[in-house]
Every structure is written in structure tokens, then in C-alpha cells.
Amino acid sequence: DTEIKVNPPQDFEIVDPGYLGYLYLQWQPPLSLDHFKECTVEYELKYRNIGSETWKTIITKNLHYKDGFDLNKGIEAKIHTLLPWQCTNGSEVQSSWAETTYWISPQGIPETKVQDMDCVYYNWQYLLCSWKPGIGVLLDTNYNLFYWYEGLDHALQCVDYIKADGQNIGCRFPYLEASDYKDFYICVNGSSENKPIRSSYFTFQLQNIVKPLPPVYLTFTRESSCEIKLKWSIPLGPIPARCFDYEIEIREDDTTLVTATVENETYTLKTTNETRQLCFVVRSKVNIYCSDDGIWSEWSDKQCWEGEDLSKKTLLR
């Protein structure tokens, strides 16, 4: 009874289609599958960025797999053929591993790459990225930003740079159609007549870097002799009400500071008859139902009440 063996996949490689970190891992079937033509061969693929503790593992019947990687580091991957137990009358048979690596040959020393890259998706509408030039680079150095997300045919270059002293130090992006809830890839590379410039790669999801506008139309409503309801409206723009968390800062008579985080556009405050002055501000942030992270908005304009009017039904600024 001869031992059943199977070859590893052929032509295993990592292909960079120019999407700034979204790579294709692809391979060809192993040779000599003649004993198993009635059987679906599977492949176990393992891959990671070099330096990562853990491998990502995929089992697939396909001859390709796509995923995002950090191109600031190298990538390593390995794959072998699996014959399920149904094909071999008992135990699963595995081939030896085929292995491959991929990295972008780095140009320039690390200090030449952009510093303090910061990207904010203002009000879920306008993406703006800014950076500082690399350490010790000359004024002739210019940086260029390229970006890609699934849905674009190819990586695009920024067309509206923010400049300082003739150098590009940021990018105002155009309208980005259907770009949220997917990886957004950025490469900032550079050129200088003096020395090579190191490229930098960044990946994030736009919904996680949203900075909303502050809430508007802050009002007071007397609910009872000892309760005041603070109300406000969601900021104008595309973010639905269900996506907001709010932080309120309330000052009573310039002394007591109350801070609270709420999910709705109202907050009920217990007050005493002695309260002479009440002020509050609100800021907003995209909540966990709509993103994994976010940036607090600026504080709203302050809304204050002073004097005897606190007993009246509604107080508007």
C-alpha cells in the first residue's frame, strides 16, 4: 500500500498591482494530481508582515488571495496543498510548503521620510492629510501623495497639495466616492536632487478618522422646578443621528463643572433654586455603532443663561 503524496503549489508569488499595500498572493496547481481528479484540492495559505508575531491563515480552493499589507515592512508567505481525508480514505495529506517573500527595496535613509503624518476625515465629507518634511532634508525635496481604495482602477496622485515654503506638506482630497468601511491606502514618496527619499505607507479606514462638526442650536427647556433639559441638534452633513456620541460640559455659577457623555441630543440637569447662571457646550464624535474610532469635534459655541429667566419655559440664545 503506497503512501499518498501530493506536491506543493507551483509558481507561488506575491504580486504588487500598484495599490500601495493591497497585494495579490497567487499560485498554480501542483503537478501530478492524477489520483485526485474527483477530489477538490485545497490550499492552506499563511502570510504576515515580517516582524509580526502571528500568521494569518486561510484555507481556500482558489488559486489566489488578496489582502492588505504594510509596505513599510517586508511580507512573507507560505502555502501547501491539502488533500482532505475524503480523498485519501482516512487522514488529511499535506504537501511540503512553498515559500515566498516580497518587499519594496527601500530608497534613502529612514529619516528622510515624512514625519507626523496626520489624516482627518472632516464631517465624513472632506479628507485632509498633513505631514512634516523628513529630518534634515533640503528645501528642494518635494513629497508626493498617492492613494488607492477598492473601487479605483489605479492609484491616484493628490491634485490639491497644501504647501509651505514651496514644499508639499499636505493634501486636500477630492470627493471620495464609496470609500468608507474599506481599507484606504496612502503612499507618500519624495524626490530630491540631493539624496534619495524614503517612501512611507499608511493604511486606515475613513470612518475611523472622522472629525464631525460641532452640534448646533443649543437650547434650555425647564422641565420642572429642579430639572432643566439641555437640547441641541446634530450638525449639518451626511452623518446620521444614530452615529453620534456627545460630550457635554456644564458650568453652574462659574463653579460647578459637570461633564457627561450621552448618546442622544438631550441631557437633563438637576438644578437648585439658587442657580444664577448656567452655561453649556457640546461636542460630537462618531460612536461605536458606526466606527471603531473617531476624533472629537470642536466644542460648540457656548449657550448661557443668566438672571431670573431660568424659571421661564424655554431659553434660547
Epitope: Q10, D11, E13, V15, D16, P17, P29, L33, K37
Partner: antibody
Framework: QVKLVESGAEVVKPGASVKLSCKAS????????MSWVRQAPGQRLEWVAT????????YYPESVKGRFTITRDNSTSTLYLEMRSLRSDDTAVYYC???????????WGQGTLVTVSS | DVVMTQSPLSLPVTLGQPASISCKAS??????VAWFQQRPGQSPRRLIY???YRYSGVPDRFSGSGSGTDFTLKISRVEAEDVGVYYC?????????FGQGTKLEIK
């Protein structure tokens, strides 16, 4: 739709070099291996070279190894075949072909005639 | 190298009648065999892969069979547009090799 368009006909002298190109469209070029196949007048098809999708792997028959080089430029979706030290028996129509995901050749270009003659 | 031997080399067929082409490999090539049609003055066109699977767009009168070393291409009812040379090819091992071709013509 998938389209493969080879460069124009070439007439060269024995010992000379020539570089053929094949422009691909209608599919994700970097995901597919590509091959060159030739056909001498009145003869069977003869495989000349294969390159994997990312260009990491190349294969040649003994008859052209060391003389022919297959390359690709995935940024322009173009396949190349550089032929050096050409001989009269290299005279043929050269086809580029896409390798499908089972390793067969599923789409072929229109062919380009290379004539090696003194 | 794997030698692919086709027979017959010439195949005269009456319109509407069936046709069969044989291809024998000099060693086991599993089911890694493809069939191509080359009409006069044209590039080869894909017909069959993995010995028996028809590519999309190929009329169902074409069928392939076989595994190991013996393979067959059948045309159930020959039509005028089927005239040309038919090639088998193995892609089980490098170098890739083709049969010498079978010329199908109408009687």
C-alpha cells in the same frame, strides 16, 4: 473583453536581436501567467516561454534557453519577448497567450511574423 | 519531454457527421490536456481544458475525454465552420508540448 495585441512584423538577419511586445487589456494582467508560442510555416505550434503573473518565475524549452528572454511590465499590461542570436529556424509567427488559472492557454493574440533571413 | 502524438493527421468528414481525434501522451499527464482549433489564417482558439471541460462560448458539439496518456476530442455533428487544424497540448510538465495537428476538412 480579453484582448492581446502583438507588435508588428519583423525581418532580421541571422545573429541579430529583436524584441516583440504584446499589449493586454480586458483583464487584471498581473493575475495571469503569460506565454509565447510560435508556429513555423506549415508546422505545429511550439511553446517558447512562460512567465508567472508577478514575473517571479520564467520557463523556456532547451531550444531557446539562453537566447530568448520573456519579461513583463504589469504597470502597462505589456508582455515582451527578447530574442537574441536569431537563426533561420526561428522564423515563425509568434503568438502571445494568456495562461488561465488552470495553466492552460485560454486567449491568444493575432500573431506577429518574425523572418530571419540573410 | 512529453511527446504528444495525434491521429489521424488528416480527417475528411461529411457535414453533419461526427468526427473524432485521438491524442496520445508519451507519459502520464493526468488530465492536464487542452485542445485548440486553428482556422485557416487565424490564431489558435481555445476549446477544451483539463481534458474534458469546455470553455464558455464553445458549442456543445465539441467534447473531450481521457486521462493519463489517452485523450480524445469529438465533434458530434461537423459544421462548415469547424474546418481547420486541431491541436492537443499538455501542460502537466515543462516543456509544454503540442501534438502535430489534425487537419479537418469537409468531404
Amino acid at each position: 473583453q480579453v484582448k492581446l495585441v502583438e507588435s508588428g512584423a519583423e525581418v532580421v538577419k541571422p545573429g541579430a536581436s529583436v524584441k516583440l511586445s504584446c499589449k493586454a487589456s480586458g483583464f487584471t494582467f498581473s493575475s495571469y501567467g503569460m506565454s509565447w508560442v510560435r508556429q513555423a510555416p506549415g508546422q505545429r505550434l511550439e511553446w517558447v516561454a512562460t512567465i508567472s503573473g508577478g514575473g517571479s518565475y520564467t520557463y523556456y524549452p532547451e531550444s531557446v534557453k539562453g537566447r530568448f528572454t520573456i519579461t513583463r511590465d504589469n504597470s502597462t499590461s505589456t508582455l515582451y519577448l527578447e530574442m537574441r542570436s536569431l537563426r533561420s529556424d526561428d522564423t515563425a509567427v509568434y503568438y502571445c497567450a494568456r495562461r488561465d488559472l488552470r495553466s492552460a492557454m485560454d486567449y491568444w493574440g493575432q500573431g506577429t511574423l518574425v523572418t530571419v533571413s540573410s | 519531454d512529453v511527446v504528444m502524438t495525434q491521429s489521424p493527421l488528416s480527417l475528411p468528414v461529411t457535414l453533419g457527421q461526427p468526427a473524432s481525434i485521438s491524442c496520445k501522451a508519451s507519459q502520464n499527464v493526468d488530465i492536464n490536456v487542452a485542445w485548440f482549433q486553428q482556422r485557416p489564417g487565424q490564431s489558435p482558439r481555445r476549446l477544451i481544458y483539463s481534458a474534458s471541460y469546455r470553455y464558455s462560448g464553445v458549442p456543445d458539439r465539441f467534447s473531450g475525454s481521457g486521462s493519463g496518456t489517452d485523450f480524445t476530442l469529438k465533434i458530434s455533428r461537423v459544421e462548415a465552420e469547424d474546418v481547420g487544424v486541431y491541436y492537443c497540448q499538455q501542460y502537466n510538465a515543462y516543456p509544454l508540448t503540442f501534438g502535430q495537428g489534425t487537419k479537418l476538412e469537409i468531404k
